[in-house]
């Protein structure tokens, strides 16, 4: 029961985590710029992995996708890659874990197969969570170091003058969503790995045979049961362990009028 609960909870936690990673990847608020007042109205800038947006105090919002793939910083490309890898691994992990759930019966799937699938999905969730955490952390480091920023300077560009304005970018909501989601996926993965240990059937290297002292009247009981004396207090006849799904104590024989000669 505890194994099923752990596996089920791990699945749900991972599901929430992966949904969060997807949400964070799609969000525009990875970095936000503090509100500043221009001569007209307050303008609020924010950027995501895919596009940059500007919102005015009037409510007007405009977003534009990043123009080129080759011109983007390597760090941004790396963050995109990490998030996408995290989503793909997480999605595959979810698919595998659905079939691995103990509460779902698919054909005559062995417990060992379910255990292996649970472990696989658990590892996938762990890697997925780590990818998301790494991606978000790399982006956060980009913001902290302000690698693209120089001090306010002026230079002549093509057809006019260009001035770089010193601005301060802060962590956007997507970063926190990503960190939490990555953590949840990681926790879910660990729970799946723990559940896997409980799912794996324990190997036994012996045959469970009951030995009894021979009595006066010994009867042969068909169906794989050992002989039993009519005198002993031990009336439970044990079935020889055949490596099947049933345990030793599952099949028991109780005395009947046919047991005695």
């Amino acid at each position: 029961m505890a194994v099923t609960a752990c596996q089920g909870l791990g699945f749900v936690v991972s599901l929430i985590g992966i949904a969060g990673i997807i949400a964070a990847t799609c969000m525009d608020q990875w970095s936000t710029q503090d509100l500043y007042n221009n001569p007209v109205t307050a303008v609020f800038n924010y950027q995501g992995l895919w596009r940059s947006c500007v919102r005015e105090s009037s409510g007007f919002t405009e977003c534009r996708g990043y123009f080129t793939l080759l011109g983007l910083p390597a760090m941004l490309q790396a963050v995109r890659a990490l998030m996408i890898v995290g989503i793909v691994l997480g999605a595959i992990g979810l698919l595998v874990s659905i079939f691995a759930l103990k509460c779902i019966r698919i054909g005559s799937m062995e417990d060992s197969a379910k255990a292996n699938m649970t472990l696989t999905s658990g590892i996938m969730f762990i890697v997925s969570g780590l990818c998301a955490i790494a991606g978000v952390s790399v982006f956060a480091n980009m913001l902290v170091t302000n690698f693209w920023m120089s001090t306010a300077n002026m230079y002549t560009g093509m057809g006019g003058m260009v001035q770089t304005v010193q601005t301060r970018y802060t962590f956007g909501a997507a970063l926190f969503v990503g960190w939490v989601a990555g953590g949840l996926t990681l926790i879910g993965g660990v729970m799946m790995c723990i559940a896997c240990r409980g799912l794996a059937p324990e190997e036994t290297n012996y045959k469970a045979v009951s030995y009894h002292a021979s009595g006066h009247s010994v009867a042969y009981k068909p169906g794989g049961f050992k002989a039993s004396t009519g005198f002993g207090s031990n009336t439970k006849n044990k079935k020889i362990y055949d490596g099947g799904a049933r345990t030793e104590d599952e099949v028991q024989s109780y005395p009947s009028k046919h047991d005695y000669v």
């Epitope: 947006c53 405009e62 260009v162 001035q163």
Partner: nanobody, 121 residues
């Protein structure tokens, strides 16, 4: 690289009209606001008018009735319609774009090369 190309300047008689335009091209991301500044001979740079992408406008005090600033968001083009021109409006007019590149390059102010408007009889 972003380029601003101005056009529409020239010689006009007092009381006449002119329409300046400024087309932005290149890798433009989030335009925060656009505007026109002017520099009269021997004087400093002064604000004429600014406009946001949302259409909020701001004019230098005594120009509001005569000058109209507008923009075409789809073409990234800025316009300045100047009516009832006076001799004191003679200046080099510069268009200005504040573009936010965010993580790709921060906040940058771009200025055009300037177009000369001469009001003379």
């Amino acid at each position: 690289e972003v380029q601003l190309v101005e056009s529409g300047g020239g010689l006009v008689q007092p009381g006449g009209s002119l329409r300046l335009s400024c087309a932005a091209s290149g890798n433009i991301l989030s335009i925060n606001y656009m505007g026109w500044y002017r520099q009269a001979p021997g004087k400093g740079l002064e604000l004429v008018a600014t406009i946001t992408r949302g259409g909020s406008t701001n004019y230098q005090g005594n120009l509001k009735g005569r000058f109209i600033i507008s923009g075409d968001n789809s073409k990234d083009t800025l316009y300045l319609q100047m009516n009832s021109l006076r001799a004191e409006d003679t200046a080099v007019y510069y268009c200005y774009f504040r573009i936010n590149f965010g993580i790709l390059g921060g906040l940058r102010d771009y200025w055009g090369q300037g177009t000369l408007v001469t009001v003379s009889s």
